[in-house]
């Protein structure tokens, strides 16, 4: 048995990293796989993840960490019975990818005006709350080339557009991801997506 | 419950040596790193030393790397601390303290011995 | 290594008084923080640890707040008992760091 892909990691900055790697075959990640992982500084014996199933030769394992400061750092060790596969480190401020934005809601009552609003996912005493900026991807179900990114680089979790600057009478959806510069992340995965229809008053033409 | 005991101070010269034991119960003591803790009289409280779990990996702090030694036996659930050369400015009560080994977990420190470094 | 400055050095308070101590870290430590409370001839008794968790045993006046660099311990009533020199600690990092010490005195 032996590790094809070593294992790569990434963490969401809060409670979660997840590793992933592949073996040479098919493996029962859970059964035959073992990764230990510890805090360096910490100096006691590791922890335990059983790896799930992520394909036929793929494991994934979700390492719990009750939080994360810059410094952290941690050793893995990917076991197989008695046998080490694999031994490496991780530090999680150098791999983050933040988690999804929630609770997407279009506003569609301020007259003529989209208001966008959605959850930030960190608690405010975590680092990241202050540091996230989105990116608001809204389509067409009707029309697959109606596809735009809004690039929102303040703090606020919201977005204002004119109901003009889309088609009256079509319904649209709207998602939302996050990143954050300060720690160079990956994007989040995208929030769920949220539908409604657009309908605007069209201004009277002018003689 | 947790329970950690320290042993083996008392009056010691300048120059000489002493070891203080810190005798274990109540939890896993092989799954834990330990430390030592000091406290000058009247002063604020020092860290002194770190031992971890399987006793491969031991840091100290400036003022007493080269003549401390931190060490352990998981076998007897017992931290031992080594100190030679000791100067007036070692005079302390020393505290070992359950290190974590996760940092949500709670600390728990011995009631301290007292070492007395004079002439 | 991790500063931490604590303040007041001393404080004077009468029994019922609500009072604040405040221990600041030179480097974000999350809430990787632990106040404990001192008597004279005694071993620090943990009172607080993870920032804000109160440690079994301990009286509900309690509390600790605060994350990232700055930490308050509060005791909303302060009681006859409550005398004596509070430190804050952070771990982490392997070598622990403590704050200088507040002696509470009580009017």
């Known amino acids: 048995m032996k590790v094809l892909q070593e294992p790569t990691c990434v963490s969401d900055y809060m409670s979660i990293s997840t590793c992933e790697w592949k073996m040479n075959g098919p493996t029962n990640c859970s059964t035959e796989l073992r990764l230990l992982y510890q805090l360096v500084f910490l100096l006691s014996e590791a922890h335990t993840c059983i790896p799930e199933n992520n394909g036929g030769a793929g494991c994934v394992c979700h390492l719990l960490m009750d939080d994360v400061v810059s410094a952290d750092n941690y050793t893995l060790d990917l076991w197989a019975g008695q046998q080490l596969l694999w031994k490496g480190s991780f530090k999680p401020s150098e791999h983050v990818k933040p988690r999804a934005p929630g609770n997407l809601t279009v506003h569609t009552n301020v007259s003529d005006t989209l208001l966008l609003t959605w959850s930030n996912p960190y608690p405010p005493d975590n680092y990241l709350y202050n540091h996230l900026t989105y990116a608001v991807n809204i389509w067409s179900e009707n029309d697959p080339a109606d596809f735009r990114i809004y690039n929102v680089t303040y703090l606020e979790p919201s977005l204002r557009i004119a109901a003009s600057t889309l088609k009256s009478g079509i319904s649209y959806r709207a998602r939302v991801r996050a990143w954050a510069q300060c720690y160079n992340t990956t994007w989040s995965e995208w929030s769920p997506s949220t539908k409604w229809h657009n309908s605007y008053r069209e201004p009277f033409e002018q003689h | 419950q947790v329970q950690l005991v320290e042993s083996g101070g008392g009056v010691v010269q300048p120059g000489r040596s002493l070891r203080l034991s810190c005798a274990a119960s109540?939890?896993?003591?092989?799954?834990?790193?330990m430390h030592w803790v000091r406290q000058a009289p009247g002063k604020g409280l020092e860290w002194v030393a770190v031992?971890?779990?399987?006793?491969?990996?031991?840091y100290y702090a400036d003022s007493v790397k080269g003549r401390f030694t931190i060490s352990r036996d998981n076998s007897k659930n017992t931290l031992y601390l080594q100190m030679n050369s000791l100067r007036a400015e070692d005079t302390a009560v020393y505290y070992c303290?359950?290190?974590?080994?996760?940092?949500?977990?709670?600390?728990?420190w011995g009631q301290g011995t007292l070492v007395t470094v004079s002439s | 290594d991790i500063v931490m400055t604590q303040s007041p050095s001393t404080l004077s308070a009468s029994v019922g008084d609500r009072v604040t101590i405040t221990c600041r870290a030179s480097?974000?430590?999350?809430?990787?923080l632990a106040w404990y409370q001192q008597k004279p001839g005694k071993a620090p008794k943990l009172l607080v640890y993870?920032?804000?968790s109160l440690e079994s045993g301990v009286p509900s006046r309690f509390s600790g707040s605060g994350s990232g660099t700055e930490f308050t311990l509060a005791i909303s009533s302060l009681q006859p008992d409550d005398f004596g020199t509070y430190y804050c600690?952070?771990?982490?990092?392997?070598?622990?760091?403590f704050g200088q010490g507040t002696k509470l005195e009580i009017k």
């Open positions: 303290a359950r290190g974590l080994t996760t940092v949500r977990g709670v600390l728990y």
């Open positions: 993870w920032a804000s």
């Open positions: 031992i971890s779990y399987d006793g491969s990996n031991k």
């Open positions: 109540g939890f896993t003591f092989s799954s834990y790193a």
């Open positions: 480097q974000s430590i999350s809430t990787r």
């Open positions: 600690q952070q771990y982490t990092s392997y070598s622990w760091t």
